[in-house]
Interface confidence: medium
């Protein structure tokens, strides 16, 4: 399985387009990949053709932050994913115990100096193929055919929905590195990003215990996060190997 994925990665490298001619770098990603439910997958991006210094790499799944690799402070894994996400190899990310819900778009966001922000996209499809195959052996042919058809239809729907989402939110950032807006629930993870009205826009300015001074209703939830989030000693981010 892992060798297969490595082959897919080697053969399916895709280059993400850039928003500005000023940015010479390109992000190579594993492109569209698939994996089996319960298995694991490695998400890999590689920044090349630039001498820019990488200061931070974010891994995101649609609107959720999975992990951060910061040049100064190393890796941070979101508590929501800490049981199923492992840092590495390199600046990549390993997803474990995959579920069908993990199907979707993943983004590697490279923050660099002086270029700005580069974003790569990977589409992951988690399949229940082995479960469907083994289950069908014990069913009458008609039920087996129906189940197979259902899987195909579901897969098609997932792909269509994902492609629609992709069109709605193309995640290529400008040189200025403008941050995407996040829902109020995600502001806890990107607290100083541009925020919708009513969210705690100054959250990053307030360590734990200061939410009483903040505007918005998200601060009570934020208060809990300040004490539980921390960077783990998972090894330094070897950014110097990433550009060339």
């Amino acid at each position: 399985m892992r060798w297969c994925l490595l082959l897919i990665w080697a053969q399916g490298l895709r280059q993400a387009p850039l928003a500005s001619g000023m940015m010479t770098g390109t992000i190579e990603t594993t492109g569209n990949i698939s994996a089996e439910k319960g298995g694991s997958i490695i998400l890999q991006c590689h920044l090349s053709s630039t001498t820019a210094q990488v200061t931070q790499v974010n891994w995101e799944q649609q609107d959720q932050l999975l992990a951060i690799c910061n040049a100064d402070l190393g890796w941070h894994i979101s508590p929501s994913f800490k049981d199923r996400v492992a840092p590495g190899p390199g600046l990549g990310l390993t997803l474990q115990s995959l579920t069908v819900n993990d199907t979707g778009e993943y983004f590697c966001i490279y923050h660099t100096y002086p270029d700005g922000t580069y974003t790569g996209r990977i589409f992951l499809e988690v399949l229940e193929s082995s479960v469907a195959e083994h289950g069908a052996r014990f069913q009458i042919p008609l039920l087996g055919a129906m189940a197979a058809t259902l899987v195909v239809i579901c897969t098609a729907v997932i792909v269509v929905v994902a492609l629609t989402r992709k069109k709605k939110a193309l995640r290529i950032h400008s040189v200025e590195g403008d941050l995407r807006r996040k829902s109020a629930g995600q502001e806890e993870w990107s607290p100083s990003a541009p925020s919708p009205p009513g969210s705690c826009v100054q959250a990053e300015a307030a360590p734990a215990g200061l939410c009483g001074e903040q505007r918005g209703e998200d601060c009570a939830e934020l208060h809990d996060y300040f004490n539980v989030l921390s960077y783990r000693s998972l090894g330094n981010c070897s950014f110097f190997t990433e550009t060339g």
């Epitope: 100064d72 941070h76 590195g177 941050l179 100054q202 307030a206 200061l210 300040f226 539980v228 921390s230």
Partner: antibody
Framework: EVQLVESGGGLVQPGGSLRLSCAAS????????MSWVRQAPGKTMEWIGN????????NYAPSLKNRFTISRDNAKNSLYLQMNSLRAEDTATYYC???????????????????WGQGTMVTVSS | DIQMTQSPSSLSASVGDRVTITCRTS??????LRWFQQKPGKAPKLLIH???NLANGVPSRFSGSGSGTDFTLTISSLQPEDFATYYC?????????FGQGTKLEIK
């Protein structure tokens, strides 16, 4: 290479004013929180305050809030500390420090201070 | 303000010694603590962040432990370049506050 260079220090009389500057290079200044920290001779460090990456939000040590003002000019990659009504006890080395990246976890603290300038000495004396 | 009590204020040790510096806070700060090293005439250098995490480029002989109100910086085997002053910093609550410092001298 990240560099922070403070300037503007010197001798000033009690009650006077002084404006310190910090020139930043080697990183995207507009992406980082910045802080000022001071250290009186032979004493521990004292956090003065910090400013959000876009300059829209500041925090100060309560004891200094009414006399000190932190500002920044992202176009010039510069951080400033305006000090008014100076007293003898303000005599110290003033450091400019780079805080955390704008979208990094709040748990990293308001002032990561991974990078520091070499400091500029301010002497308040008559 | 959160009060920081750092001890000892000074310490004499020899190369190869194991040294422990403690920092106690007046209230629970979780793991929001950093340790800095400062040499005379120089700016402080970050050693430990998040109470236990080694900053990039810092030798593995340095380690941090503790959470809540009691924290420890340990140098497993002192090297000549480790003789300096060490400070703890809490960043759980404004204003950020530093410990009084521990001056580590050669015995």
């Amino acid at each position: 290479e990240v560099q922070l260079v403070e300037s503007g220090g010197g001798l000033v009389q009690p009650g006077g004013s002084l404006r310190l500057s910090c020139a930043a290079s080697g990183f995207t200044f507009s992406d980082h929180w910045m802080s000022w920290v001071r250290q009186a001779p032979g004493k521990t460090m004292e956090w003065i305050g910090n400013i959000q990456y876009d300059g829209s939000y500041t925090n100060y040590a309560p004891s200094l809030k009414n006399r000190f003002t932190i500002s920044r000019d992202n176009a010039k990659n510069s951080l400033y500390l305006q000090m008014n009504s100076l007293r003898a006890e303000d005599t110290a080395t003033y450091y400019c420090t780079r805080g955390h990246f704008r979208i990094t976890m709040a748990s990293m603290g308001a002032s990561a201070s991974v990078y520091w300038g070499q400091g500029t000495m301010v002497t308040v004396s008559s | 303000d959160i009060q920081m009590t750092q001890s000892p204020s000074s310490l004499s040790a020899s190369v190869g010694d194991r040294v422990t510096i403690t920092c106690r806070t007046s209230q629970d700060i979780g793991n929001s603590l950093r340790w800095f090293q400062q040499k005379p005439g120089k700016a402080p250098k970050l050693l430990i962040h998040g109470a236990t995490n080694l900053a990039n480029g810092v030798p593995s002989r340095f380690s941090g432990s503790g959470s809540g109100t009691d924290f420890t910086l340990t140098i497993s085997s002192l090297q000549p370049e480790d003789f300096a002053t060490y400070y703890c910093l809490q960043h759980n609550e404004y204003p950020l506050t530093f410990g009084q410092g521990t001056k580590l001298e050669i015995k």
